[in-house]
């Protein structure tokens, strides 16, 4: 069937980087500037993608490629092929309707993007705290009380962690 | 063809004001949401104010109590009333069509202004 159609069909021998060309009897043209096709066969090429704005050039657009973009600093991307980009928060904060807001007490997120998680609950694995959780950070657990055997050397119990506060932005 | 051109920008002191306009055209303004995001010299671009179309407005907390966004439909105008300017809002402002209407999210869709600078020194 291939055969048959390359036969009937003189657009099917027109590559990549070109469209054929109806206005010419068909024949293969190139892409115009800012186009491109990434398969043969093509009747039109495709508009190149633009990164403008937010959005930063990642990868140039080819006559067989589309241009890929990236977001520029201060935010990151979400969605096939990066379609959005979204503003970073700081460790310990996530991004609301309102902006970058601190993490809840007993929460936290240890990176520049996504929501606050709840700190791990030790005790659910019958483990103890061996480091409190921060905005930034969440709990260590640590053995349970009854793997710490008399006379062990016990770890120091940590700091009560300090009332949460709205750190300065 | 979509257009949105920046002006108002200029040189301030600490403390002074500054109104920023963005005319539109080339699409429905009525019924779009729009922003304003700034870039600092060296810095990377940061989401400042929006507002939706039924005049809904969210601003970064930098700017809260400061920055004013408001939008005529009438004239295809967004504004930006900026008082007690500070050294540190120093920045080219950029006005864009905010079509994801998140707060600080952008689409590839979304469309941008050549922006304008904004100086704040003594």
């Known amino acids: 069937f291939e055969r048959t159609r390359s036969l009937q069909d003189p657009c099917s021998n027109c590559p990549a980087g070109t469209f054929c060309d109806n206005n010419r009897n068909q024949i293969c043209s190139p892409c115009p500037p800012n186009s491109f096709s990434s398969a043969g066969g093509q009747r039109t090429c495709d508009i190149c993608r633009q990164c403008k704005g937010v959005f930063r050039t990642r990868k140039e657009c080819s006559s067989t490629s589309n241009a890929e973009c990236d977001c520029t600093p201060g935010f990151h991307c979400l969605g096939a092929g990066c379609s959005m980009c979204e503003q970073d928060c700081k460790q310990g904060q996530e991004l609301t309707k309102k902006g970058c807001k601190d993490c809840c007490f007993g929460t936290f997120n240890d990176q520049k993007r996504g929501i606050c998680r709840p700190w791990t609950n030790c005790s659910l694995d019958g483990k103890s705290v061996l480091v409190n959780g921060t905005k930034e950070r969440d709990v260590v657990c640590g053995p349970s009380p009854a793997d710490l055997s008399p006379g062990a050397s016990s770890v120091t119990p940590p700091a009560p962690a300090r009332e949460p506060g709205h750190s300065p932005q | 063809e979509v257009q949105l051109l920046e002006s108002g920008g200029g040189l301030v002191q600490p403390g002074g004001s500054l109104r920023l306009s963005c005319a539109a055209s080339?699409?429905?303004?009525?019924?779009?949401?729009m922003s304003w995001a700034r870039q600092a010299p060296g810095k990377g671009l940061e989401w400042v104010s929006g507002?939706?179309?039924?005049?809904?407005?969210y601003y970064t907390e930098s700017v809260k109590d400061r920055f004013t966004i408001s939008r005529d439909n009438s004239k295809n105008t967004l504004y930006l009333q900026m008082n007690s300017l500070r050294a540190e809002d120093t920045a080219v402002y950029y006005c864009a069509k905010w079509g994801t209407l998140r707060f600080g999210v952008w689409a590839e869709y979304d469309h941008w202004g050549q922006g304008t600078l904004v100086t704040v020194s003594s």
């Open positions: 080339g699409f429905t303004f009525s019924s779009s949401a």
């Open positions: 507002i939706y179309s039924g005049g809904s407005t």
